[in-house]
């Protein structure tokens, strides 16, 4: 029962984690305009992995996609790749783990097969979580580096009295979502791996029980039928039924006369 609970909980935690990784990857607020100790602007800038957005005081928000691949920083491309790999591995892991769940019977699948699938999905979740954490951390490091660089030359002179104020960016909500989601996926994967150990068949020596019938002596061995059909003779075959209950100022969006990209 504890094994089923650990496996089920690991699955749910990983599911939440992967949903979080997907959400973080799609979010626009990976980096947000730093409002502290900065000139007060009437617009608020924030950026994601796929597009950058500007919100005006009126609440009007305009987003523009990064239409170039080659023109983007290599670090951003790396972060994108890590997040996508994390999502793909996590999705495959979820698919595998559904079939591996002890509370779900699929045909005559043996516990040894389920144990292997649980371990596989667990490893996938761990790698998925690590990819997400790595991706978010690389982006965060990039932000920190750029933040201090732009602080060092916050006002870039353009000759005479004309100056350009560089917009500084700080951590956006997506980073925290990504870190938490990656951590949850990692924890879920570890739980799946722990559950796998409990699912793995143990070597049990069954004693033969002799029944003396009149005329003939026939020995019935438990698991004998299984042995003849090619399945392991010492596999535990408990059927467990699990219930499986799993549980800015208001911004207005205005009709735009411009196409959003």
């Amino acid at each position: 029962m504890a094994v089923t609970a650990c496996q089920g909980l690991g699955f749910v935690v990983s599911l939440i984690g992967i949903a979080g990784i997907i959400a973080a990857t799609c979010m626009d607020q990976w980096s947000t305009q730093d409002l502290y100790n900065n000139p007060v602007t009437a617009v608020f800038n924030y950026q994601g992995l796929w597009r950058s957005c500007v919100r005006e005081s009126s609440g009007f928000t305009e987003c523009r996609g990064y239409f170039t691949l080659l023109g983007l920083p290599a670090m951003l491309q790396a972060v994108r790749a890590l997040m996508i790999v994390g999502i793909v591995l996590g999705a495959i892991g979820l698919l595998v783990s559904i079939f591996a769940l002890k509370c779900i019977r699929i045909g005559s699948m043996e516990d040894s097969a389920k144990a292997n699938m649980t371990l596989t999905s667990g490893i996938m979740f761990i790698v998925s979580g690590l990819c997400a954490i790595a991706g978010v951390s690389v982006f965060a490091n990039m932000l920190v580096t750029n933040f201090w660089m732009s602080t060092a030359n916050m006002y870039t002179g353009m000759g005479g009295m004309v100056q350009t104020v560089q917009t500084r960016y700080t951590f956006g909500a997506a980073l925290f979502v990504g870190w938490v989601a990656g951590g949850l996926t990692l924890i879920g994967g570890v739980m799946m791996c722990i559950a796998c150990r409990g699912l793995a068949p143990e070597e049990t020596n069954y004693k033969a029980v002799s029944y003396h019938a009149s005329g003939h002596s026939v020995a019935y061995k438990p698991g004998g039928f299984k042995a003849s059909t090619g399945f392991g003779s010492n596999t535990k075959n408990k059927k467990i039924y699990d219930g499986g209950a799993r549980t800015e100022d208001e911004v207005q969006s205005y009709p735009s006369k411009h196409d959003y990209v």
Epitope: V43, V54, S57, F60
Partner: antibody, heavy 119, light 113 residues
């Protein structure tokens, strides 16, 4: 049709106070940020204060900070500017302006109310 | 505070003439996030409140005649009236609509010869 009507102007003694009002109609007042802009006689425009639609964000010009208070009553569709410690240089026509959808511009203005600070 | 400098302070023109007025800001009004310039132009006729003409440096407000054209980027901006009409005689103000405090230029007065 969008309408902004200012009131509350008049003659005030230096150091005195005055509360200006701006009655809005023809649009959903609670959805728009609002500004006060003033214009001294025969002079240019000077931005005074801004208040966001839900009063969460408020900004003031350095010249009025600590003396003027911008506020709004959304159910009554009214914008206010409480002016205190008035000086002769505060003599101007006070306009209320609606923050437009785009470009942080003022797309509609009232006719203005004249505040004269004089002994 | 952003300083907005308008030139010339006054312009004397004849009807039908093309006219250009300038506005210079002490800091760039270009926002890198959406590549838009937060510069607004207003027209104020005698005894009237200002009227919005152009926002984002070059986008005409609805109802504004197409003879009014805004241009420029960064710190240098222009307002061009392709063919001045009698009703265009007014004061024209440019405004920094990017940084708080929002600041206006001193204005350019358009007069008829």
């Amino acid at each position: 049709d969008v309408q902004l009507v200012e009131s509350g102007g008049g003659l005030v003694q230096p150091g005195g106070s005055r509360k200006l009002s701006c009655a809005a109609s023809g649009f959903t007042f609670s959805r728009f940020g609002m500004h006060w802009v003033r214009q001294a006689p025969k002079k240019g425009l000077e931005w005074v204060a801004y208040i966001s639609s839900g009063s969460n964000t408020i900004y003031y010009a350095d010249t009025v900070k600590g003396r003027f208070t911008i506020s709004r009553d959304n159910p009554k569709n009214t914008l206010f500017l409480q002016t205190t410690s008035l000086r002769s240089e505060d003599t101007a026509i006070y306009y209320c302006g609606r923050l437009g959808f785009y470009g942080n511009s003022f797309d509609h203005w009232g006719q203005g109310t004249l505040v004269t600070v004089s002994a | 505070n952003i300083l907005m400098t308008q030139s010339p302070s006054s312009l004397t023109v004849t009807a039908g003439e093309k006219v250009t007025m300038n506005c210079k800001s002490s800091q760039s009004l270009l926002n890198g996030g959406n590549q838009r310039n937060y510069l607004t132009w207003y027209q104020q006729k005698a005894g009237q409140p200002p009227k919005l003409l152009i926002y984002w440096a070059s986008t005409r407000e609805s109802g504004v005649p197409d003879r009014f054209t805004g241009g420029g980027s960064g710190t240098d901006f222009t307002l061009t009236i392709s063919s001045v009409q009698a009703e265009d005689l007014a004061l024209y103000y440019c405004q920094n609509s990017y940084y708080y405090p929002l600041t206006f230029g001193a204005g350019t007065k358009l007069e008829l010869k």
